[in-house]
Interface confidence: medium
């Protein structure tokens, strides 16, 4: 069973939400359960640092892009966000939290600034920012 | 394994327009970005451009904005490139490139599309 | 855009002999550069990615190198199946440039 919810502060359009956890799940209260992904869009303005800090004390992490199938709510997320996304100066990468690499089929990278970190726009696009800046940002729990 | 098949050979007049198409097997279509290059003969690689078959997001290279149009089918896995207005330049031969991890890891064989009045 | 020079355009060598091709970007493309062998009529094949990351199935004899602005690409011993032209191509910012390529040929 599906409900169709307008999140309007946070989707362009409306989104399909699973309305029982036996379909998805479980994950912390209040939070959006898709696709055995729990996400939390924090409205209160971080930098990267603390962003990550708040995701972890709630046992999450910042929000990682890893399939645009399973992630496709993704493409309607409004306004940008800190996700797990770091530039490693040594190796000239871009790794998720966990220090796996990106893969460049799942995010267009723009500099829109000079930085270290990137921030998450709609349609899986990553906006490269000082990780010093304040923004909001996305938790992510996976749930399998 | 992974194939990307390219049309044949094509000849064309000034003016006209060319549709390549790159047909892929092997793995998951829309996973990943499709690119075009071409080289002229004797020449080296330009990349013409991208798209994204998961939702048909393209980028093209500034050079050939308005000319290069790049359209997938996702129930064929085909992959589209058309160039327009096309002139004795244009000769070619026209790849279409999976992406890989920061490459081009597999690359059709190739289109030759002669332009000639 | 991100211009590529690669050096030399060409060069004459020998089986056995250490080959070095060099690839300047005009400007930092921290790391994001690849390498591929093309032979005449053929596709080119990628050899490296991420400056030093040897692709599938290509042997340990090439080897890639460099960051921020100079990478190299270098096969250790030449061999007959390595004459070819080499092309190297960035993936910092689009337009994904090439280079303009090294042929390497038989001396």
């Known amino acids: 069973i599906w409900s169709a919810v307008f999140l309007n502060s946070l989707f362009n359009q409306e989104v399909q939400i699973p309305l029982t956890e036996s379909y998805c799940g479980p994950c912390p209260k209040n939070w959006i359960c898709y696709k055995n992904n729990c996400y939390q869009f924090f409205d209160e303005s971080k930098n990267w640092y603390e962003s990550q800090a708040s995701c972890m004390s709630q046992n999450a992490s910042l929000l990682k892009v890893y399939s645009k199938e399973d992630q496709d709510l993704l493409k309607l997320v409004k306004s940008y966000h800190w996700m797990g996304l770091v530039h490693i100066p040594t190796n000239g990468s871009w790794q998720w939290e966990d220090g796996s690499i990106l893969s460049p089929n799942l995010l267009t990278i723009i500099e829109m600034q000079k930085g270290d970190c990137a921030l998450y726009a709609s349609s899986f696009k990553g906006y490269i920012e000082n990780c010093s800046t304040p923004n909001t940002y996305i938790c992510m729990q996976r749930t399998v | 394994q992974v194939q990307l098949v390219q049309s044949g050979a094509e000849v064309k007049k000034p003016g006209a327009s060319v549709k390549v198409s790159c047909k892929a097997s092997?793995?998951?279509?829309?996973?990943?970005?499709m690119n075009w290059v071409r080289q002229a003969p004797g020449q080296g690689l330009e990349w013409m451009g991208r798209?994204?078959?998961?939702?048909?997001?393209?980028h093209y290279n500034q050079k050939f904005q308005g000319r290069v149009t790049m359209t997938v089918d996702k129930s064929t896995s085909t992959a589209y490139m058309e160039l327009s207005s096309l002139r004795s330049e244009d000769t070619a031969v026209y790849y279409c490139?999976?992406?890989?991890?920061?490459?081009?890891?597999?690359w059709g064989q190739g289109t030759l599309v002669t332009v000639s009045s | 855009d991100i211009q590529l020079t690669q050096s030399p355009s060409s060069l004459s060598a020998s089986v056995g002999d250490r080959v070095t091709i060099t690839c300047r970007a005009s400007?930092?493309?921290?790391?994001?550069l690849a390498w591929y062998q093309q032979k005449p009529g053929k596709s080119p094949k990628v050899l490296v990615y991420?400056?030093?990351t040897l692709a599938d199935g290509v042997p340990s004899r090439f080897s890639g190198s460099g960051s921020g602005t100079d990478y190299t690409l270098t096969i250790s011993s030449l061999q007959p199946e390595d004459f070819a032209t080499y092309y190297c191509?960035?993936?910092?910012?689009?337009?994904?440039?090439f280079g303009g390529g090294t042929k390497v040929e038989i001396k």
């Open positions: 400007g930092n493309i921290h790391n994001y």
């Open positions: 991420n400056a030093k």
């Open positions: 191509q960035h993936f910092w910012s689009t337009p994904w440039t």
């Open positions: 490139a999976k992406m890989g991890d920061y490459s081009f890891d597999y």
């Open positions: 092997g793995y998951t279509f829309t996973s990943y970005w």
């Open positions: 798209i994204d078959p998961y939702d048909s997001e393209t």
